[in-house]
Interface confidence: medium
């Protein structure tokens, strides 16, 4: 599986899950978020050559197609599969307000 | 929606579902296939700038993460939502065979 | 460069039947289509039928269906359209054309065309 | 078979003029659609694919739009070059149909 487990061990050039770390004020500028100031929320990237991670059959299609015609600019690509929730900690007035934002961390990619 | 109704209709650059003719026997060496000789597979491709059809929290995140690091290798790809199956023809041995291959045909896409 | 380049002009009697050829070079034949389109004098253009010469996979249409042979050598890269039982209306530049890789049917490259006169 | 019925069958316009042919199938071939130029004696020579797709090496006063039932083949700015017949071809289904063609001619 092109998962954080397999991924982040090896120097892996075609899709899987890359580390990203968001820093909420500073690269998104949401200021509203108390706790946690950032956090890993990974990205998918990479090249799918034919029948790495297909997602369907018309990913599986479409890179063979890619690999016959390499000039032709369609091509499946790399997304995220498995993603997990993040909780924060935000304030409404005085109030602390605790919620879990869902498909926040990407654990594995795909190629779709 | 970034279906084949608005994106054939519209010279849109942003991600969109694209025409894609597949041959079969040139495109992709399937000789076996009998009926139809090709089949419209289509195929998503176009940036996916922030909050267009973004499909997770995710998404929505690295769009944003990406339009205020625009430097950054990290952004979301436009890739198939909507699948439709494609019936074919082929022969095992003189024995015709009627088989529906699902998730053949790209409808619409989103960013991912 | 990819070329297509056709037999020469026929004169044929009705009834009869007539071998066009188109020979292929500059790409590999054996995987691309190749398609038979026709012009009668002063006419426009019509499609008449198609091979693959990886597998000598045919389609035709209707209208041509049973009078009309499309085969493919591949060791010479030659592509022949026969058309049997010709009446004066077969009278028509005949063209091969190559389908356009990465594309459906747009035809990329065409033969110089070959004219047949059925006449008695 | 699907009809491809094309118009006008032919036109004059002055060298500059913004030429327009128009191409109506008969049912939906989304947006599979070729356009051809042919002078006489000549082949056809491929000009747009895919409805508004320009070939390689067409000059950009060719254009080409459309989806479904209904398409446009433009010539910007008419050259005397430009003198010929132009034919539309549905590659959507097979028998690949072509319509009957419009002969551009300068004023």
């Known amino acids: 599986a092109l998962d954080t487990n397999y991924c982040f061990r090896n120097l892996e050039e075609n899709c899987c899950v890359r580390p990203l770390y968001i820093d909420f004020r500073q690269d998104l500028g949401w200021k509203w978020v108390h706790e946690p100031k950032g956090y890993y929320a990974n990205f998918c990237s990479g090249p799918c050559p034919y029948l790495r991670s297909a997602d369907t059959t018309h990913s599986t299609v479409l890179g063979l197609y890619n690999t016959l015609n390499p000039e032709a600019s369609a091509s499946p690509c790399c997304v995220p599969q498995d993603l997990e929730p993040l909780t924060i900690l935000y304030y409404v007035g005085r109030t602390p307000k605790v919620e879990q934002l869902s498909n926040m961390v990407v654990k594995s990619c795909k190629c779709s | 929606a970034l279906d084949t109704n608005y994106c054939f209709r519209n010279l849109e650059e942003n991600c969109c579902v694209r025409p894609l003719y597949i041959d079969f026997r040139q495109d992709l060496g399937w000789k076996w296939v009998h009926e139809p000789k090709g089949y419209y597979a289509n195929f998503c491709s176009g940036p996916c700038p922030y909050l267009r059809s973004a499909d997770t929290t995710h998404s929505t995140v690295l769009g944003l993460y990406n339009t205020l690091n625009p430097e950054a290798s990290a952004s979301p790809c436009c890739v198939p939502q909507d699948l439709e199956p494609l019936t074919i023809l082929y022969y095992v041995g003189r024995t015709p065979k009627v088989e529906q291959l699902s998730n053949m045909v790209v409808k619409s896409c989103k960013c991912s | 460069q990819v070329q297509l380049v056709q037999s020469g002009a026929e004169v044929k009697k009705p009834g009869s039947s007539v071998k066009v050829s188109c020979k292929a070079s500059?790409?590999?034949?054996?995987?691309?289509?190749i398609h038979w389109v026709r012009q009668a004098p002063g006419q426009g253009l019509e499609w008449i039928g198609r091979?693959?010469?990886?597998?000598?996979?045919?389609d035709y249409s209707e209208k041509f269906q049973g009078r009309v042979t499309i085969t493919a050598d591949k060791s010479t890269s030659t592509a022949y359209m026969e058309l049997s039982s010709l009446r004066s209306e077969d009278t028509a530049v005949y063209y091969c054309?190559?389908?356009?890789?990465?594309?459906?049917?747009?035809?990329?490259?065409w033969g110089q065309g070959t004219l047949v006169t059925v006449s008695s | 078979d699907i009809q491809m019925t094309q118009s006008p069958s032919s036109l004059s316009a002055s060298v500059g003029d913004r030429v327009t042919i128009t191409c109506k199938a008969s049912?939906?071939?989304?947006?599979?659609v070729a356009w051809y130029q042919q002078k006489p004696g000549k082949a056809p020579k491929l000009l747009i694919y895919?409805?508004?797709n320009r070939y390689t090496g067409v000059p950009d006063r060719f254009s080409g739009s459309g989806y479904g039932t209904d398409f446009t083949f433009t010539i910007s700015s008419l050259q005397a070059e430009d003198v010929a017949v132009y034919y539309c071809?549905?590659?959507?289904?097979?028998?690949?149909?072509f319509g009957g063609g419009t002969k551009v001619e300068i004023k």
């Open positions: 054309a190559r389908r356009m890789i990465t594309t459906q049917a747009a035809l990329d490259y």
């Open positions: 500059g790409y590999t034949f054996s995987s691309s289509w």
């Open positions: 091979i693959y010469p990886g597998d000598g996979d045919t």
């Open positions: 049912q939906s071939v989304i947006n599979a």
């Open positions: 895919y409805a508004s």
């Open positions: 071809q549905q590659d959507y289904s097979s028998p690949y149909t």
